[in-house]
């Protein structure tokens, strides 16, 4: 596959991943009520996200409440907010870096510098994926740990929500896309004879003895 095709595929994956990350960040479904026993008579499901919590009645009526105080939030919610928003913003920066380094754009003159810019874009997307993966895994670890903790009240046990799965899929796309962008950039820099014109040096002047240097002859 050519470097341009790798770049395009990588960028498409990264853009889809970026969209998924924005979706995961905004959805109030990082954790959802776990129904462990048939004898719990409940008419509602609770969803919790980074920005709000929602109560869904059995009738289908949903009521959401945005978290009032940042200081009242748990450490992992505050950290997840910071890291996911940072990942989304970094992916936005990575998009412009990648476009600047893309072979189909003229922002940067063709050459090793352009390939390096493209490589930087790929690395930024890889870093985005890793950055987003931290809060997703941290949050999931807490949810799972509390689910199996016998001290946690039954009605306060939660399961992993859809937002976490969307987030994991998004980070996978960001990292795979980032790798493809890096590969595309590497293909460009790795074959200078194909990518860039070869420069020949002028023959050296004759030596004092009048002989030409032997190494100038093919």
């Amino acid at each position: 596959m050519g470097s341009a095709a790798l770049e395009i595929l990588g960028l498409v994956l990264c853009l889809v991943g970026w969209g998924g990350l924005i979706l995961a960040c905004g959805l109030p479904m990082w954790q959802v009520t776990a129904f462990l026993d048939h004898n719990i008579v409940t008419a509602q499901t609770t969803w919790k996200g980074l920005w709000m919590s929602c109560v869904v009645q059995s009738t289908g009526h949903m009521q959401c409440k945005v978290y009032d105080s940042v200081l009242a939030l748990s450490t992992e919610v505050q950290a997840a907010r910071a890291l996911t928003v940072s990942a989304v913003l970094l992916a936005f920066v990575a998009l412009f870096v990648t476009l600047a380094g893309a072979q189909c754009t003229t922002c940067v003159a063709p050459g090793p510098a352009k390939a390096r810019v493209a490589l930087t874009g790929g690395v930024l997307y890889l870093f985005c994926g890793l950055l987003a993966l931290v809060p997703l895994c941290w949050f999931a670890n807490i949810v799972v740990r509390e689910f199996y903790d016998p001290s946690v009240p039954v009605s306060q046990k939660y399961e992993l929500g859809a937002a976490l799965y969307i987030g994991w899929a998004a980070t996978a796309l960001l990292m795979v896309g980032g790798c493809l962008l890096c590969c595309g950039a590497w293909v460009c820099t790795g074959r200078p004879d194909l990518s860039f014109p070869v420069k020949y040096s002028a023959p050296r002047r004759p030596t004092a003895t009048g002989d030409y240097d032997k190494k100038n002859y093919v």
């Epitope: 026993d37 719990i40 001290s151 946690v152 009240p153």
Partner: antibody
Framework: EVQLVESGGGLVQPGRSLKLSCAAS????????MAWVRQAPKKGLEWVAS????????YYGDSVKGRFTISRDNAKSTLYLQMKSLRSEDTATYYC??????????WGQGVMVTVSS | DIVMTQSPSSLAVSAGETVTMNCRSS????????????LAWYQQKPGQSPKLLIS???TRESGVPDRFIGSGSGTDFTLTINNMQAEDLAIYYC?????????FGAGTKLEL
């Protein structure tokens, strides 16, 4: 030996605040959920509030929700109960308890809180 | 909320006899997930703090004499004291430790 020693009780006027403390020893404090349970004079037991290991999760009984705040300081092995807008029905002996697996396995000697004008 | 109902409220007993008290919950305390019944029994002697005797309906705490036996189904539970001793005179409370709000029964008082 597990020991739970409550302090901070006394006579307080309705509408005022009071903070109870519970000094724990004889076990690794941060490894356990902790709780407050109260008992009105000549009455039964009533669960007040519970708190998770590091204080991330707190749970309250309906009668105290919004008025009482449970907290803990793991470095000092101390449990707290901040009581605001006290009412006469809050008059009780307040017990600090260790709270594994949702039951209460060790209890303090209790501290009396009297709400009266 | 789960309502706990204890019966009888008081019981006249004699040393050496077998004493039985009951506790009923308004909903099942049996968890199909981990196959456990979440009911605890406490003993409170006059002027003292409550003491945990039994958890998970039938698991005796360490140091609790084996004359104390807990049993029961999902909603109906029993605490039996075999060979009643004078030191067993107290109020006995049941508590559901299934879910919040954790609730106690009104107690069964054992009297001579």
């Amino acid at each position: 030996e597990v020991q739970l020693v409550e302090s901070g009780g006394g006579l307080v006027q309705p509408g005022r605040s009071l903070k109870l403390s519970c000094a724990a020893s004889g076990f690794t404090f941060s490894d356990y959920y902790m709780a407050w349970v109260r008992q009105a004079p000549k009455k039964g037991l009533e669960w007040v509030a519970s708190i998770s290991y590091e204080g991330r999760n707190t749970y309250y009984g309906d009668s105290v929700k919004g008025r009482f705040t449970i907290s803990r300081d793991n470095a000092k092995s101390t449990l707290y109960l901040q009581m605001k807008s006290l009412r006469s029905e809050d008059t009780a002996t307040y017990y600090c308890t260790r709270h594994p697996r949702r039951y209460f396995d060790y209890w303090g000697q209790g501290v009396m809180v009297t709400v009266s004008s | 909320d789960i309502v706990m109902t204890q019966s009888p409220s008081s019981l006249a007993v004699s040393a050496g006899e077998t004493v039985t008290m009951n506790c009923r919950s308004s909903q099942s305390l049996f968890s199909s997930g981990d196959q456990k019944k979440f009911l605890a029994w406490y003993q409170q002697k006059p002027g003292q703090s409550p003491k945990l005797l039994i958890s998970l309906a039938s698991t005796r705490e360490s140091g609790v004499p084996d004359r104390f036996i807990g049993s029961g189904s999902g909603t109906d539970f029993t605490l039996t004291i075999n060979n009643m001793q004078a030191e067993d005179l107290a109020i006995y409370y049941c508590q559901q430790h299934y879910d919040i709000p954790y609730t106690f029964g009104a107690g069964t008082k054992l009297e001579l």
